[in-house]
C-alpha cells in the first residue's frame, strides 16, 4: 500500500527544504525565505522561529531546520528548546517574585539558577563536619566518628566498587 501510494503521490518525492506546491501541479518548490521543512513530502513549510528580545540566535534557520535560540547574558533557558528565558542570580541567591534574594542561613545555591537547598546534615549520614557551608556551597562532610577512634586504621581505604554511570577515579 505504501509503495502504491508513493507512486500515486508525487509529493512524496519532495525532499526536506521543499514543499509540494498544490498551486503548481504539485511540483516541489523551495521553501520561501524564513521558512523550512525538516522532512520530505511536506505540503507546507514551517515559519522559522525568530529569536528576539531576550532571546538570541544560537543557530540560524535554514531551509531544512528551524532556528535555535538561547538567552542573552544575564538570563538562562527554561523549557524544551529554550522556550523561556529566566533571569540569572548570583551564586548564593535564588530568584523570587521580588527578584534575586540571598539564600537563608543553612541553605546554599552553587549556581546562577535554581533554588537554595539545605546544607547537608553530616551527622544524618554518619559523618563529621570538615568545613562549614556557605551561601554559595554545601557543607563538606568529613570522616565518620568511628574512623577517628583510637585504633582506627589510617591507611587509605581501597577504592569502592565502581557504580554504574560513574567513571573510575
Amino acid at each position: 500500500f505504501e509503495r502504491t501510494r508513493s507512486l500515486q503521490d508525487p509529493c512524496s518525492n519532495c525532499p526536506a527544504g521543499t514543499f509540494c506546491d498544490n498551486n503548481r501541479n504539485q511540483i516541489c518548490s523551495p521553501c520561501p525565505p524564513n521558512s523550512f521543512s525538516s522532512a520530505g513530502g511536506q505540503r507546507t513549510c514551517d515559519i522559522c522561529r525568530q529569536c528576539k528580545g531576550v532571546f538570541r540566535t544560537r543557530k540560524e534557520c535554514s531551509s531544512t531546520s528551524n532556528a535555535e535560540c538561547d538567552c542573552t547574558p544575564g538570563f538562562h533557558c527554561l523549557g524544551a528548546g529554550c522556550s523561556m528565558c529566566e533571569q540569572d542570580c548570583k551564586q548564593g541567591q535564588e530568584l523570587t517574585k521580588k527578584g534575586c534574594k540571598d539564600c537563608c542561613f543553612g541553605t546554599f545555591n552553587d549556581q546562577k539558577r535554581g533554588i537554595c537547598r539545605p546544607w547537608t546534615n553530616c551527622s544524618l549520614d554518619g559523618k563529621s563536619v570538615l568545613v562549614n557551608g556557605t551561601k554559595e556551597r554545601d557543607v563538606v562532610c568529613g570522616p565518620s566518628p568511628a574512623d577517628l577512634s583510637p585504633g582506627a586504621s589510617s591507611v587509605t581505604p581501597p577504592a569502592p566498587a565502581r557504580e554504574p554511570g560513574h567513571s573510575p577515579q
Epitope: V139, C141, T156, H166
Partner: nanobody, 125 residues
C-alpha cells in the same frame, strides 16, 4: 585513587614553629577539601584544620586558632600546616586527610575518604 604523603614532623621545643606538608598524587582533580587531623597517644583523632581546595575557605579547631595556619598550593597539589607557638598538648601524630565531593558525597556516588600514613610531632618542654 588519591595518595597522600605527609612530611615535616619532628621534635621541637614549646614555643617553636613547625611546618607540615601533605603532597597529593593520583586523581587529585577529584579532591574537594583537605584537612589535618591529629591523634594524641591513646586519644581520639581530632580535626585540627581543613581547607576547601577551590576557594580556600578554612575551618580551625578552637584550640589552634591564631597559632596554626592551613594553606594549599593547587598547582603543586600540596597542603600545608604552619604551626606556631607550639604547646605540649600539640604532641600527636598528624594525619593528612582528603575528601572528594561536597556534602556527604553520597548523592554523587562518591564515598571517598583518603588518609596519609601520619607524621609524628613531639613538643617538649
Amino acid at each position: 585513587q588519591v595518595q597522600l604523603q605527609e612530611s615535616g614532623g619532628g621534635l621541637v621545643q614549646a614555643g617553636d614553629s613547625l611546618r607540615l606538608s601533605c603532597a597529593a598524587s593520583g586523581s587529585t582533580f577529584s579532591i574537594t577539601a583537605m584537612g589535618w587531623y591529629r591523634q594524641p597517644p591513646g586519644k581520639q583523632r581530632e580535626l585540627v584544620a581543613a581547607i576547601i581546595m577551590s576557594d580556600g575557605d578554612t575551618n580551625y579547631q578552637d584550640s589552634v586558632k591564631g597559632r596554626f595556619t592551613i594553606s594549599r598550593d593547587n598547582a603543586k597539589n600540596t597542603m600545608y600546616l604552619q604551626m606556631n607557638s607550639l604547646k605540649l598538648e600539640d604532641t600527636a601524630v598528624y594525619y593528612c586527610y582528603a575528601r572528594t565531593g561536597y556534602g556527604s558525597g553520597r548523592l554523587m556516588g562518591h564515598e571517598y575518604d583518603y588518609w596519609g600514613q601520619g607524621t609524628q610531632v613531639t613538643v617538649s618542654s
